[in-house]
């Protein structure tokens, strides 16, 4: 009897009610390996889940998360909400980044602004909740009499007005 069942291919099940005949999986079910005695119910992607791959007789459906959420867990078993840039996801929802930190992604945590002075540089552009600071030349480079590190501006192409 076992040998008869082992002949049943993926997409079928070994039907004990019909003398070990290989029967096709019913609608909305699948078997991904041969020799199965039952077919598994297809996963349904609904609510915050959307279908990435339809279920077939030999493979389960695959889900993704709808816009505004991202997958977590094995095979996208959970959908976690996105936050806006300048926020981080906490256990109690999306919270704005504290002063001195930023997040330029829709997920992850707020990170401290770069400390330009650690590299002997100055702050060229201030940081925001969404963006890190931009470090510029060291303060010494900007002191009067220091040679300019800026190359001369290239000649404008004819027909182009200045920006």
């Amino acid at each position: 009897l076992q040998d008869l069942c082992s002949n049943c291919p993926a997409g079928t099940f070994c039907d004990n009610n019909r003398s070990q005949i290989c029967s096709p999986c019913p609608p909305n079910s699948f078997s991904s390996a041969g020799g199965q005695r039952t077919c598994d119910i297809c996963r349904q992607c609904k609510g915050v889940f959307k279908t990435r791959k339809e279920c077939s007789s030999t493979s389960n459906a695959e889900c993704d998360c709808i816009s505004g959420y991202h997958c977590l867990g094995a095979e996208c078993s959970m959908c976690e909400q996105d936050c806006k840039q300048g926020q981080e996801l906490t256990k109690k929802g999306c919270k704005d980044c504290c002063f001195g930190t930023f997040n330029d992604q829709k997920r992850g945590i707020c990170r401290p602004w770069t400390n330009c002075s650690l590299d002997g540089k100055s702050v060229l552009v201030n940081g925001t909740k969404e963006r890190d600071v931009v470090c510029g030349p060291s303060p010494a480079d900007l002191s009067p009499g220091a040679s300019s590190a800026t190359p001369p501006a290239p000649a404008r192409e004819p027909g182009h007005s200045p920006q």
Epitope: L89, T90, K91
Partner: nanobody, 124 residues
Framework: EVQLLESGGGLVQLGGSLRLSCAAS????????MTWVRQAPEKGLEWVSS????????YYADSVKGRFTISRDNSKNTLYLQMNSLRAEDTAVYYC?????????????????WGQGTTVTVSS
């Protein structure tokens, strides 16, 4: 291999009670904080409760405070969630999760391993 296996879910009447369990293996259970989260059918993941590795500190979402109790038995490598006065909005798949450190709180998610989930349905 680190594994978390939830059990205890099922169909329960409005106002009823359920106790979820999460059996842990593959790591030193008492060294890590643990968390319960849930996902309702039409919603994203919602944090429910967290407990420190020692069990001394517990934290709850406002929506379950006073109704749910998180606990752990480190000798049995098991996490629990006692759910009382259940409401329709508690219907969800409940997941237990291992945090990366022994301490926890009600701010950051710090989770690195998730269970497969157990379904709780509250019917009226």
């Amino acid at each position: 291999e680190v594994q978390l296996l939830e059990s205890g879910g099922g169909l329960v009447q409005l106002g009823g009670s359920l106790r979820l369990s999460c059996a842990a293996s593959g790591f030193t259970f008492s060294s890590y904080a643990m968390t319960w989260v849930r996902q309702a059918p039409e919603k994203g993941l919602e944090w429910v409760s967290s407990i420190s590795g020692s069990g001394g500190n517990t934290y709850y979402a406002d929506s379950v405070k006073g109704r749910f109790t998180i606990s752990r038995d480190n000798s049995k490598n098991t996490l629990y969630l006692q759910m009382n006065s259940l409401r329709a909005e508690d219907t969800a798949v409940y997941y237990c999760a291992k945090e990366r450190t022994g301490t926890t709180g009600d701010y950051y998610y710090n989770v690195d391993v998730w269970g497969q989930g157990t379904t709780v349905t509250v019917s009226s």
